[in-house]
């Protein structure tokens, strides 16, 4: 028998210092995570002790802090390099600048592979970017080698901008034959490394003949065996055993996100390379780690950059941009327009003729709008301004929810109206009407959305049963500020770009901003 | 002793069609890859074709591709080489050989090989 | 396709003598590459495996060197037995590619 260690992140989403329990910037040094500095110390721990060790990523290393919006990748090779990781899958959000935003400072500069067989280059791109992505790597460990096939969500051209030229195949049909010319290449220790999310990830290993082992990303899913030992609870065991169609037993794993854990899979195989046994647990990356001095001193060379840049000047305001609880939490305000204005800019995707955009709505808590921003400052905007507007560090997420869900979405937004309560929802995309006289959860009297299956954008009325895709907050997402009909109802969600990235990259690209009140929100006569 | 014996070789028209056979001894047969391998005379080694241990994957270089087909019989220790629309060009020496188990692919035992003449 | 590219040719040798054959792939192949001898008239024989490592049974006169994209087979000391052509291989994917040959011969 034989044995593979295999240590793997995914959504690591540009946390490369480290962070506070929840992922945000870290406050309390002596209870920080993560981090690549901490990451390092604890795989070179475990590859002094083991033999047979491979260290993966799969996906979503691209963007959610500062380090993304100054770096826009240059960091994730560097630093992935410096960890000597041995493969990488790409996930949706590595195409946030394009395709060139990923050629340019990953793919020419990393020293490991990164892989993908179900992402075709066509036409000019073709010739451009052949060999700097692979569908497939064969890695020498020990005295075996490993095949490492990788994969990434067919729903990227939704998520990301990945343009005309790169076709996204089902993941399970362009999987099969790179598995299959692996076995018959003589290689008989397959790993899936991919960025499709859980659900696709159980599917793969039931479905693709020869994947031994799938390692996953895009859903963030936190396994565990035992006892979690933070927050995260778990969705089920680690490994996830997954029956194949074939009979085998096939472990499926991801390791939640955001560089907190680091994946740890322990797998035997037989001389054929059938998987006797597997275990492990993700490792919870906390204090009791030290960062690697040499790691953490270049962290803290390349965050002096950092420091500069969240002082300049992104682009102008020439309104007031009222970000106050007294209206955020009230009544529609013009921080909330410009936020919900930008979302959906940075969702503007033309995948279709019959459709102008694939999605129009965006729905926003008031009380995640943390602060003003004034104009009789020259109409500065900086990174801190914005910082202190979003000072949470979550995503922009997109979710598909029936007319219902959101229904009950804005009967929440104000069941309670008028305690300064977080849950008052700003809008775009959205024309909404109270009547506050009446009773809590039959208020909302007119909700009408944009439409996106036209070429004139117009509002029509809100259908029931109809299933809409919207931009939100992943706070909202996750059932925050009490929405727990979204958490529960909605049928997809794709975790999105930064907050403050997809605002500061509007404003850039805007230059000067102006946002109004414009009757998205309405209060019918008498009650309000 | 472990052993391969092509047979099947021979003299053929254009355009007509010949079969080649490998018989397998010694050795686990239905556990290894097997590959066709030829060499026209005074030229250099050419890769033709392999078939997965179960049979169930092949592939081929693209000079025959649609037009040679491998395929073997597990229970007969036996590969075969199926071509049609032969050409002047396809004449060579045949040699079935073993992959061995590991990667990359080397070929561990081979046949003596089997002359195929295309010829008018 | 992955092109192997064998140099030289031909060499001319003497018993005793060193020879060093180069084959060069078009692309990274690691070090997935294999030699073989082969005598006019017989069937091919592998030499080397990977790059470095020696066909158990083969002389260690033989030797094979190099990663990536140039490799090397060393004869030490040529023996007459080790008057033939010898092939580089790789199957670091299909199709698979042999090398146009190296022919050794009597000096």
């Known amino acids: 028998a034989w044995e593979l260690t295999i240590l793997h992140t995914n959504d690591v989403h540009s946390r490369l210092e480290q962070t506070s329990e929840d992922s945000s910037k870290c406050v309390n040094a002596s209870r920080c995570m993560g981090g690549v500095a901490r990451l390092f110390t604890k795989v070179q721990q475990i590859r002094r002790a083991e033999p047979n060790v491979l260290l993966l990523d799969a996906g979503d290393q691209y963007q959610g802090t500062i380090w993304f919006t100054v770096y826009k990748g240059a960091e994730v090779a560097h630093f992935m390099n410096a960890l000597r990781y041995d493969a990488m899958a790409l996930g949706n959000h590595e195409f946030d600048n394009g395709v060139e935003g990923l050629i340019e400072p990953l793919l020419k500069e990393a020293k490991f592979p990164i892989l993908s067989a179900n992402i075709k280059a066509k036409g000019p791109l073709a010739s451009q970017i052949s060999g700097l992505y692979l569908p497939y790597k064969v890695l020498p460990v020990g005295d075996e080698v490993v095949g490492i096939v990788g994969y990434t969500s067919k729903e990227t051209p939704f998520l990301s901008n990945p343009g005309t030229n790169l076709v996204f195949e089902d993941e399970i049909t362009a999987l099969q034959p790179e598995v299959d010319k692996l076995k018959t290449l003589n290689v008989n220790k397959i790993i899936a490394l991919g960025h499709s999310g859980f659900e696709m990830d159980k599917l793969i290993a039931q479905k693709v003949r020869g994947v031994d082992v799938v390692v996953g990303g895009h859903s963030n899913t936190f396994l565990y065996t035992g006892n979690p030992p933070s927050k995260e609870v778990p969705a089920g065991k680690y490994p996830f055993i997954v029956t194949s169609d074939d009979g085998r037993k096939v472990p499926v794993v991801q390791a939640y996100a955001f560089g907190k854990y680091l994946g740890y899979l322990k797998i035997e195989f037989d001389e054929r390379g059938n998987v006797i046994s597997s275990h492990g647990n993700p490792i919870l990356l906390n204090s009791s780690i030290p960062e690697d001095p040499s790691i953490k001193a270049d962290i803290n060379k390349w965050r002096i950059k950092l420091d500069n840049y969240s002082t300049q000047e992104l682009g102008k305001t020439i309104v007031y941009l009222d970000g106050s609880s007294q209206s955020c939490r009230f009544r529609e305000c013009n921080m909330g327009n410009l936020i919900c204005d930008a979302m959906i800019n940075n969702n503007l995707r033309h995948t279709d003729e019959m459709f102008w955009n694939h999605v129009s709505m965006c729905i926003l808590n008031g009380g995640g709008i943390r602060s003003p921003i004034d104009e009789r400052n020259n109409g500065t905007i900086t990174w801190e301004n914005l910082a202190a507007v979003l000072p949470f560090g979550g995503t922009f997420d997109l979710v598909q929810l029936k007319g219902s869900t959101l229904k009950k979405a804005f009967e929440h937004s104000v069941h309670r109206y008028g305690q300064s309560t977080g849950e008052f929802l700003q809008v775009g995309g959205i024309h909404v009407v109270y009547d506050l006289s009446r009773k809590p959860g039959d208020r909302v009297v007119k909700l009408d959305v944009l439409c996106t299956k036209c070429r004139v954008p117009s509002y029509d009325p809100l259908k029931m049963d109809e299933v809409y895709k919207v931009i939100l907050p992943n706070f909202l997402a996750n059932g925050g500020d009490g929405f727990q009909m979204i958490k529960d109802e909605l049928l997809r969600h794709d975790s999105g770009d930064q907050d403050i990235n997809v605002v500061s990259t509007y404003i850039s690209k805007m230059k000067v901003i102006y946002p109004a009140v414009e009757g998205r929100i309405k209060f019918s006569t008498g009650s309000h | 002793q472990v052993q391969l014996v092509e047979s099947g070789g021979g003299v053929v028209q254009p355009g007509r069609s010949l079969r080649l056979s490998c018989a397998a001894s010694?050795?686990?047969?239905?556990?290894?890859?097997m590959h066709w391998v030829r060499q026209a005379p005074g030229k250099g080694l050419e890769w033709v074709a392999v078939?997965?241990?179960?049979?169930?994957?092949?592939y081929y270089a693209d000079s025959v591709k649609g037009r040679f087909t491998i395929s073997r019989d597990n229970s007969k220790n036996t590969l075969y080489l199926q071509m049609n629309s032969l050409r002047a060009e396809d004449t060579a020496v045949y040699y079935c050989?073993?992959?061995?188990?590991?990667?990359?692919?080397?070929?561990?035992?081979w046949g003596q090989g089997t002359m195929v003449t295309v010829s008018s | 396709d992955i092109q192997l590219t064998q140099s030289p040719s031909s060499v001319s040798a003497s018993v005793g003598d060193r020879v060093t054959i180069t084959c060069r792939a078009s692309?990274?192949?690691?070090?997935?590459l294999a030699w073989y001898q082969q005598k006019p008239g017989k069937a091919p024989k592998l030499l080397i495996y990977?790059?470095?490592s020696l066909q158990s049974g083969v002389p260690s006169r033989f030797s094979g060197s190099g990663s990536g994209t140039d490799f090397t087979l060393t004869i030490s000391s040529l023996q007459p037995e080790d008057f033939a052509t010898y092939y580089c291989?790789?199957?670091?994917?299909?199709?698979?590619?042999f090398g146009g040959g190296t022919k050794v011969e009597i000096k």
């Open positions: 050989a073993r992959g061995w188990l590991r990667y990359p692919i080397a070929f561990d035992i």
């Open positions: 010694g050795f686990t047969f239905s556990h290894y890859g």
């Open positions: 078939i997965s241990d179960e049979g169930s994957n092949k």
């Open positions: 692309q990274d192949i690691s070090s997935w």
């Open positions: 990977a790059a470095s």
């Open positions: 291989q790789q199957a670091n994917d299909f199709p698979i590619t």
